[in-house]
């Protein structure tokens, strides 16, 4: 595979990594779909210093990041822990809340006006950010 | 200029298999995502596959999941359909189209000729 | 899957008609929506994305209006060259999905 060395046109770099903010909403399966159609992946948020980063970014509006625990327990879409990982949740979230009447709980996790955490209906069409690492090989399947 | 050309169309039983090619030229070829759209005769277009520009992440239309297989070689600047278990249904012209892009991918702005394929015993 | 319905399904015109074809998605798609329009034998070409926006190269005769759920491809001033099968195609989720085309032919 190829390696990225720099960031794609419209992408913004920050410690190796690079990031794409919306500028319109989707729901979270649409989202990561776009990230993936990227070759990249809903932001996974591992400090304190990417969280101010992105919350600068995105400023106070609702923003899909890379959470969901749509199986289950809480993961990130790439595969980083989120037991031993940073989280930066809104007092008592996530709720799992059922009261919004549209049916099921809350399974995916957004930033919020001030920047921390909550849990919502995946359905519902937020703004999202991309990331993709930079160096990291591009992982090109075998052709058949 | 931006072109596309597809090939590897033609006649093939029901059950069997046939490999779609679509070369590329005048574009940065791994930054640009792309997809198959088809066409049965005298119908509307279906879109088929995307992948990804560096070909990590594929999206099909669930009538072809499991049969179809979209891949890329960027080294050689061409994208393929790989299309197994083929149907009766599965007879259209294949057209290979680039994703257009400005801040968002946007729609399918480059489009080749078609290549037809026939499934037919 | 995003059910995609043009209406009409045809239409008859004559040279310097304005003509109006309508698209409804079956759920919200903002505006992640294109136009294509397509002449016997040949491929597809993206005339409107992002449902208002013009394709670099396509006349300015040609315009997209419309957010959410209803859209609409207008043509100002129908040219000779504009007859032919226009599709509207959302690009808001997988697995992208196209109406079912209208028709433009010559009254």
């Known amino acids: 595979g190829s390696e990225r060395t720099c960031c794609p046109v419209n992408w913004v770099e920050h410690e190796r990594s690079c990031y794409w903010f919306s500028r319109s909403g989707k729901a979270w399966a649409d989202a990561d779909n776009y990230c993936r159609l990227e070759d990249a992946h809903l932001v996974v948020v591992t400090s304190w210093e990417e969280q101010k980063f992105v919350q600068h970014h995105i400023g106070p509006v609702n923003t899909w990041m890379g959470l969901h625990d749509q199986n289950g327990p809480w993961k990130w879409v790439d595969g980083t822990d989120y037991e031993t990982g940073f989280k930066n949740w809104r007092p008592e979230q996530p709720d799992d809340w059922y009261g919004h009447g549209l049916g099921g709980g809350e399974d995916c996790a957004h930033f919020t006006d001030d920047g921390r955490w909550n849990d919502d209906v995946c359905q519902r069409p937020y703004r999202w950010v991309c990331e993709t690492e930079l160096d990291k090989a591009s992982q090109e399947p075998p052709l058949l | 200029e931006v072109q596309v050309l597809e090939s590897g169309g033609g006649l093939v039983q029901p059950g069997g298999s046939l490999r779609l090619s679509c070369a590329a030229s005048g574009l940065t070829f791994s930054s640009s995502a792309m997809s198959w759209v088809r066409q049965a005769p005298g119908k509307g277009l279906e879109w088929v596959s995307a992948?990804?520009?560096?070909?990590?992440?594929?999206f099909y239309t669930d009538s072809v999941k499991g049969r179809f297989t979209i891949s890329r070689d960027n080294s050689k600047n061409t994208l393929y359909l790989q299309m197994n278990s083929l149907r009766a249904e599965d007879t259209a012209v294949y057209y290979c189209?680039?994703?257009?892009?400005?801040?968002?991918?946007?729609?399918?702005?480059?489009w080749g000729q078609g290549t037809t394929v026939t499934v037919s015993s | 899957d995003i059910q995609m319905t043009q209406s009409p399904s045809s239409v008859s015109a004559s040279v310097g008609d304005r003509v109006t074809i309508t698209c409804r998605a079956s759920q919200g798609i903002s505006t992640w929506l294109a136009w294509y329009q397509q002449k016997p034998g040949k491929a597809p070409k993206l005339l409107i994305y992002?449902?208002?926006s013009l394709q670099s190269g396509v006349p300015s005769r040609f315009s997209g209006s419309g957010s959410g759920t209803d859209f609409t491809l207008t043509i100002s001033s129908l040219q000779p060259e504009d007859f032919a099968t226009y599709y509207c195609?959302?690009?808001?989720?997988?697995?992208?999905?196209f109406g079912q085309g209208t028709k433009v032919e010559i009254k």
């Open positions: 189209a680039k994703l257009g892009k400005d801040y968002y991918y946007y729609g399918m702005d480059v």
């Open positions: 195609q959302q690009a808001n989720s997988f697995p992208w999905t």
């Open positions: 992948i990804s520009g560096r070909g990590g992440n594929t």
């Open positions: 992002d449902a208002s």
